[in-house]
């Protein structure tokens, strides 16, 4: 069976890393486990990993935004940032604003790698399933 | 044969959903049909679906922009928005501006699903083949 | 073996096309050659090609930004732009700013095609491996 995941935004995320909807809606989870915000790899190989985050706010103050996909493995002492997007000076002060960040690339992942998504400012994330998501598939 | 499509912008289109060039240039269409703006799935399975839209204008007024990939199937009464990008407050008032929206993710699609792309303002889309496109491939 | 590449930003790039790190870090290069900034295809077929570029500056002057993935083949007299992103009027004058451009799509590539990435303003690119990259894989 194809190893694949597509998880969507979960609005009751209160901490980092982001948590994801893994059951309802347009979610996919096959041959990969989901655990506390992370996708857990159980077969070493090449994977295309992607994520989109939708940021928005009522009144722009140009707070710097970052969106990271990172990897954690008990064998390594430190998280590895695989992909990252940053935004600064992206809207007009005081205005209602909205912006997305998209990341996607190929990585060689190892069994027991845990993949997570982090953002700099949780309160500015909108968690609609079509707008904020995290996924991968094994090539 | 691999089921794959890569369609590019078609500039004389006035209708929603967007219409696409399916014949000339860097277009691909194999094992998938194109019909009135839509990619028609003829084999159930997992697909990576993507789209990019290039918005631009002569004089910025920060018109809210949206870019959606959605699915329609005669079995279901309503369109399903699979992926969406929104932009608000993205340029400096009065200036010439340009911005892209990119979407891409994995979905479980069913034979007879029709996939389309919608934008909030057609007048602000530039249809160059390298800038605005819509595609998918079966995993 | 799967034909795949993921190259990351190389900060000593001084000219176009961009040059890439092809050895250290989260780099992948298998069944594809890297030569003077280009990925060289050695087997005709369908490929998903992607790139992300992270632009940033100390003081915004809204210099138009472009990010292109293009193809060169000795059989053809001219480069073919496969994907392109442009940005104009994207930050507030005088402010520190940061923005990414992401491109990704499927193409039918031929043995001996050379793929490159070009940007309009090299001095505004940040080459962190998680932020600026270029890759592909054969479907």
């Amino acid at each position: 069976l194809r190893k694949v995941a597509h998880l969507t935004g979960k609005s009751n995320s209160r901490s980092m890393p982001l948590e994801w909807e893994d059951t309802y809606g347009i979610v996919l989870l096959s041959g990969v486990k989901y655990k506390k915000g992370g996708l857990v790899i159980n077969e070493t190989g090449l994977y295309f990993v992607y994520s989109k985050v939708y940021f928005r706010g009522q009144s722009c103050n140009n707070l710097p935004l970052s969106h990271k996909v990172y990897m954690r493995n008990s064998k390594y002492p430190q998280d590895l940032v695989m992909m990252e997007g940053k935004m600064m000076s992206y809207c007009t002060t005081g205005q209602m604003w909205a912006r997305s960040s998209y990341l996607g690339a190929v990585f060689n992942l190892t069994s027991a790698d845990h993949l997570y998504v982090n953002v700099s400012e949780l309160s500015l994330v909108n968690f609609e399933e079509s707008q904020t998501f995290f996924g991968l598939y094994k090539l | 044969l691999r089921k794959v499509a890569h369609l590019t912008g078609k500039s004389n289109s006035r209708s929603m959903p967007l219409e696409w060039e399916d014949t000339y240039g860097i277009v691909l269409l194999s094992g998938v049909k194109y019909k009135k703006g839509g990619l028609v799935i003829n084999e159930t399975g997992l697909y990576f679906v993507y789209s990019k839209v290039y918005f631009r204008g002569q004089s910025c007024n920060n018109l809210p922009l949206s870019h959606k990939v959605y699915m329609r199937n005669s079995k279901y009464p309503q369109d399903l928005v699979m992926m969406e990008g929104k932009m608000m407050s993205y340029c400096t008032t009065g200036q010439m501006w340009a911005r892209s929206s990119y979407l891409g993710a994995v979905f479980n699609l069913t034979s007879a699903d029709h996939l389309y792309v919608n934008v909030s303002e057609l007048s602000l889309v530039n249809f160059e083949e390298s800038q605005t496109f819509f595609g998918l491939y079966k995993l | 073996l799967r034909k795949v590449a993921h190259l990351t930003g190389k900060s000593n790039s001084r000219s176009m096309p961009l040059e890439w790190e092809d050895t250290y870090g989260i780099v992948l290069l298998s069944g594809v050659k890297y030569k003077k900034g280009g990925l060289v295809i050695n087997e005709t077929g369908l490929y998903f090609v992607y790139s992300k570029v992270y632009f940033r500056g100390q003081s915004c002057n809204n210099l138009p930004l472009s990010h292109k993935v293009y193809m060169r083949n000795s059989k053809y007299p001219q480069d073919l732009v496969m994907m392109e992103g442009k940005m104009m009027s994207y930050c507030t004058t005088g402010q520190m700013w940061a923005r990414s451009s992401y491109l990704g799509a499927v193409f039918n590539l031929t043995s001996a095609d050379h793929l490159y990435v070009n940007v309009s303003e090299l001095s505004l690119v940040n080459f962190e491996e998680s932020q600026t990259f270029f890759g592909l894989y054969k479907l």
């Epitope: - | 004389n12 006035r14 002569q58 018109l63 909030s120 303002e121 007048s123 | -």
Partner: antibody
């Protein structure tokens, strides 16, 4: 900058036709609709129809019962509105306006052309 | 067709005061994304000028004292502090479907 320049005032007899022109500049003519809106003396605004110069498609307000025809010439970036079977109640100022396709708000207007229908 | 009804027909306001103009649609002009209502100002002998689009978005070059609100069938144009140049006729227009229709207008005059 965007400009829409209309042809001059016309005086017409009842039963005749009038053709008003609207020359666009400062933007890509084929990417926006051109709408026509009229305003009778001391009255409000009435939308007559639009044309999309990109492919020549058009839509009309049924209140005009086939009397209105809107055309466009891409080579000169000019739109035209022809109103036939004129009657006295067609006396009005006729405006062309650039319209965004999807949002359909009128963001730039011509200066207006007064058409007087009188015997 | 959708009928747009504006009220009041005439509004007498002193310079510096706030003006609130209403527009009601005979059926909803909103979708999940946007409310397809636009506001224009017209002065004698001039074409209309776009002020607010999609119910609440200020057109480029329009002073911030103009604002719009509402959804569904009820919409409001507010001028926070009337200036002498604001005395004019104001029209709402919908673009939810064909035909596009305008309200009959509200004349804002000096009190």
């Amino acid at each position: 900058q965007v400009q829409l320049v209309q042809s001059g005032a016309e005086v017409k007899k009842p039963g005749s036709s009038v053709k008003v022109s609207c020359k666009a500049s400062g933007y890509t003519f084929t990417r926006f609709d051109i709408s026509w809106v009229r305003q009778a003396p001391g009255q409000g605004l009435e939308w007559m129809g639009w044309i999309f110069p990109g492919d020549g498609s058009s839509q009309y307000n049924e209140n005009f019962k086939g009397r209105v025809t809107i055309t466009a010439d891409k080579s000169t970036s000019t739109a035209y509105m022809e109103l036939s079977s004129l009657r006295s109640e067609d006396t009005a100022v006729y405006f062309c306006a650039r319209s965004l396709i999807s949002t359909a708000m009128f963001d730039h207007w011509g200066q207006g052309t007064l058409v007087t229908v009188s015997s | 067709e959708i009928v747009m009804t504006q009220s009041p027909a005439t509004l007498s306001v002193s310079p510096g005061e706030r003006a609130t103009l209403s527009c009601r649609a005979s059926k909803s002009v909103s979708t999940s994304d946007f409310s397809y209502i636009h506001w224009y100002q017209q002065k004698p002998g001039q074409p209309p000028r776009l002020l607010i689009y999609l119910a609440s978005h200020l057109e480029s070059g329009i002073p911030a004292r103009f604002s719009g609100s509402g959804s569904g069938t009820e919409f409001t144009l507010t001028i926070s502090s009337l200036q002498s140049e604001d005395f004019a006729v104001y029209y709402c227009q919908h673009s939810r479907e064909l035909p596009r229709t305008f309200g009959q207008g509200t004349k804002v005059e000096i009190k």
